[in-house]
Interface confidence: low
């Protein structure tokens, strides 16, 4: 049996994957434990096995079809259990009545690239990954910069109230080597959170000419 | 066989409130959702609300305010209360089943039952 | 709210005629529905998702569509199929029918 206080935390890709993270105070000895995902409306079921993250905490990914399959849309309901073995039978630990698109984390946005780099500036483009088509263009983002020195908590967040896929970073010190990540998040969804952050991409500014600042 | 019995209409005074029940048999209310939808005389159908298998809510904001869905799971009935009634609310009331495919629709319906708002 | 807009509200034909309904949607709809309704009886559902025929309808029944704008066809008229035809929209809440067809036998 299992005691202590219970938190069970799911978001959606927005196309085929549930991530869900389950918290118990309680210790869980050798107990094995799943979240079993059960549409109002589709034929499909899905369970994945719960591994642990932490002492007290455990994780597990949804996977409901190809990546770019849209698995869901704005009208389902996904009731999400977690459940726990004890002896020859299953417990409920956690239920939820899963709303999909209030529940919103994107996958990080992937291949960064430098477009065009000058000694003061540099542009950058990237894409997102396994995003809804229904989306359309209600999308926002978030960059970061780490400049030498410096850690990434002491990054000044910039924001793009649109979606748009590209930065033009100025103010830039020539010669010197940066990173730069980029998160997205969409506008709807009551407990939509930003996506984790990109993989940084490294840079370095062009030296600047001899004599003259370009 | 999926199977849904809607009772309780009958004659409500304005201002006054109604409990309607659907008792599902052939499936469980814990395992789908059970929709509302009301018709007026002579009138369009009109959704009311949802309460999904779960035990969660969704409701037609036009009557958020004045309506509850509600259910047993022991009983495997589900609720329907609407309060501060008015004569605009006389109606055929309906409580529906989704099928089980891939947005199947309102597959499974209840006869209706007849709620009559009138002094 | 999105408003399904049906056309004609009522039509009279003859049995054996082909009979065409659209459902206009102000806003564009993934999934759509068409239902039947006789008098004094519950709706019954004819066409899941823009054309999937539900379980024990005739293939007389079809429907088409995308976006804003669907059709629901009858190729061939019987006498039971006088009733009111409904579309219905299940891409955002709230669920939301149109006004209804009636369709009478000449």
């Known amino acids: 049996a299992v005691n202590g206080t219970s938190q069970f935390t799911c978001f959606y890709n927005s196309r085929a994957n549930i991530s869900c993270v389950w918290s118990q105070d309680g210790a869980l000895q050798d107990t094995s434990c799943q979240v079993h995902a059960w549409p109002d409306r589709r034929r499909w079921n899905q369970t994945c096995e719960l591994l642990p993250v932490s002492q007290a905490s455990w994780a597990c990914n949804l996977i409901l079809g190809a990546p770019d399959s849209q698995k869901l849309t704005t009208v389902d309901i996904v009731t999400l259990r977690v459940l726990c073995r004890e002896g020859v039978r299953w417990r409920v630990m956690a239920i939820q009545d899963f709303k999909p698109f209030e529940n919103l984390r994107l996958m990080a946005p992937i291949s960064l690239q430098v477009v065009h780099v000058e000694t003061h500036r540099c542009n950058i483009s990237w894409e997102i990954s396994q995003a809804s088509h229904y989306f359309e263009r209600h999308l926002e983002f978030e960059a970061r910069t780490l400049s030498p020195g410096h850690t990434w908590e002491e990054a000044p967040l910039l924001t793009l109230k649109q979606k748009q896929e590209w930065i033009c970073l100025e103010t830039l010190t020539p010669d010197t080597q940066y990173e730069f990540q980029v998160r997205v998040k969409p506008l709807q969804g009551e407990f939509t959170t930003w996506s984790p952050w990109s993989q940084p991409l490294a840079f370095r500014t062009k030296p600047a000419a001899l004599g003259k600042d370009t | 066989e999926v199977q849904l019995l809607e009772s309780g209409g009958g004659l409500v005074q304005p201002g006054g409130s109604l409990r309607l029940s659907c008792a599902a048999s052939g499936f469980t209310v814990t395992s789908y959702a059970v929709h509302w939808v009301r018709q007026a005389p002579g009138k369009g159908l009109e959704w009311l609300g949802v309460?999904?298998?779960?035990?969660?809510?969704d409701y037609n904001a036009a009557f958020i305010s004045r309506l509850t869905i509600s259910k047993d799971n022991s009983k495997n009935t589900v609720y329907f209360q609407m309060n501060s009634l008015r004569a605009e609310d006389t109606a055929v009331y309906y409580c529906?089943?989704?099928?089980?495919?891939?947005?199947?629709?309102?597959?499974?319906w209840g006869q209706g039952t007849l709620v009559t708002v009138s002094s | 709210d999105i408003q399904m807009t049906q056309s004609p509200s009522s039509l009279s034909a003859s049995v054996g005629d082909r009979v065409t309904i659209t459902c206009q949607a102000s806003q564009s709809v993934s999934f759509l529905y068409w239902y039947q309704q006789r008098p004094g009886k519950a709706p019954r559902l004819l066409i899941y998702d823009t054309s999937n025929l539900a379980s024990g309808v005739p293939s007389r029944f079809s429907g088409s569509g995308s976006g804003t704008s669907y059709t629901f066809t009858i190729s061939s008229l019987q006498p039971e199929d006088i009733a009111t035809y409904y579309c219905q929209q299940w891409s955002t809440y709230p669920l939301t029918f149109g006004q209804g067809t009636k369709v009478e036998i000449k």
């Open positions: 529906a089943r989704a099928g089980d495919a891939n947005y199947d629709g309102f597959a499974y």
């Open positions: 309460i999904w298998s779960g035990g969660s809510t």
